[in-house]
């Protein structure tokens, strides 16, 4: 089982949509898949997939879940809010018919405020 | 390109243990998401998958060879082994050894083949 | 473990003719999650390796020549030349990855008349 997770880094407005894609590709086929998303190690969702579809649609504060065969799984985010800036990573294992499991690399969330005001602030803020 | 050669003894005694090596050039096996896999070919037959080794290290045997077959990696020499215990005359083939993706589920690059009999 | 039946077992064939082989699997080899049939055919040309013309049931791997087509769904598949030429010649196997054990079919040997 091996997971692709993209993009590695986006940035998108407060009030905007963002889009995580999860590629997850097995040489063998699957009867059950359980899938999950964490944001900053924290669990959003953790649904899983058979017969082609999802068991839950929804993940976390405004984040919804779609899987479109052969192999994406998507969490999209609309609208983005200033909470979502975060570590996003997407795991994956088949339970059935044997457990297997993987997991993608960290997509770095950053939400930029809708006041230009605040992203000078915020800016600013940064250190060094 | 991506290149597999097996090599090892092409003849074996009976009960004695067959070893064979694989060693894969433009390409790493330690690349996530690959099997390392072996087939058999036995005179004038069908092919019969023996086993793979994915990324990881875990291990996947066909049911009618496991108790024999012991397949590995030597990540710093950049090959796959294959040992097969206790062969009988029957165990004489062509054995090959090939790669297969999680992206794909089929076998895209194959050695030459290597024959090896069985005889005492 | 999945059986997979192939006929006929030996293929003579014109050239400039069409050829059919066909591939039955024990159990179906479509998956609903994926939406995809774990079938490949692979052609063995004498004293060579197997080298794989289709996957997923009906995609040509590049490089392979147009007249080379897969079909079929299910437990039920077919490879087609549709005008085979001399370099054809060979063992063409039909080949499960939707469970391990891994399993081929014993082979089709096309022949030229």
């Known amino acids: 089982l091996s997971v692709q997770q993209g993009p590695n880094l986006l940035q998108v407005r407060q009030g905007s949509q963002a889009t995580l894609v999860c590629q997850v590709d097995q040489a063998t086929a699957w009867e059950r898949l359980r899938v999950k998303w964490t944001k900053d190690g924290a669990i959003l969702c953790q649904p899983y997939i058979t017969n082609g579809s999802l068991s839950l649609g929804v993940c976390g504060p405004q984040g919804r879940l779609s899987w479109q065969a052969p192999s994406h799984l998507t969490l999209q985010l609309d609208p983005v809010s200033l909470n979502h800036s975060g570590a996003y990573v997407c795991w994956a294992a088949v339970e059935i018919p044997e457990l297997e499991e993987a997991e993608g690399n960290i997509t770095r969330l950053f939400v930029d405020p809708d006041d230009p005001t605040q992203n000078r602030n915020r800016i600013a803020s940064f250190p060094g | 390109q991506v290149q597999l050669q097996e090599s090892g003894p092409g003849l074996v005694k009976p009960s004695q243990t067959l070893s064979l090596t694989c060693t894969v050039s433009g390409f790493s096996i330690t690349t996530g998401g690959y099997y390392w896999s072996w087939i058999r070919q036995h005179p004038g037959k069908g092919l019969e998958w023996i086993g793979y080794?994915?990324?990881?290290?875990?291990?996947y045997y066909n049911p009618s060879l496991k108790s024999r077959v012991t397949i590995s990696v030597d990540t710093s020499k950049n090959q796959f082994s294959l040992k097969l215990s206790s062969v009988t005359a029957a165990d004489t083939a062509v054995y090959y050894c090939?790669?297969?993706?999680?992206?794909?589920?089929?076998?895209?690059?194959w050695g030459q083949g290597t024959l090896v009999t069985v005889s005492s | 473990d999945i059986v997979m039946t192939q006929t006929p077992s030996s293929l003579p064939v014109t050239p400039g003719e069409p050829a059919s082989i066909s591939c039955l699997s024990s159990q179906s080899l479509f998956s609903s999650n994926t939406k995809r049939n774990y079938l490949n055919w692979y052609l063995q040309k004498p004293g060579q390796s197997p080298k794989l013309l289709i996957y997923?049931?009906?995609t040509r791997l590049s490089g392979v020549p147009d007249r080379f087509s897969g079909s079929g769904s299910g437990t039920d598949f077919t490879l087609k030349i549709s005008r085979v030429e001399a370099e054809d010649v060979g063992d063409y196997f039909c080949q499960q990855h939707y469970e391990t054990p891994l399993t081929f079919g014993d082979g089709t040997r096309l022949e030229i008349k």
């Open positions: 997923h049931a009906s």
């Open positions: 080794i994915y990324t990881s290290g875990r291990t």
């Open positions: 090939a790669d297969m993706a999680d992206k794909g589920g089929w076998f895209a690059y």
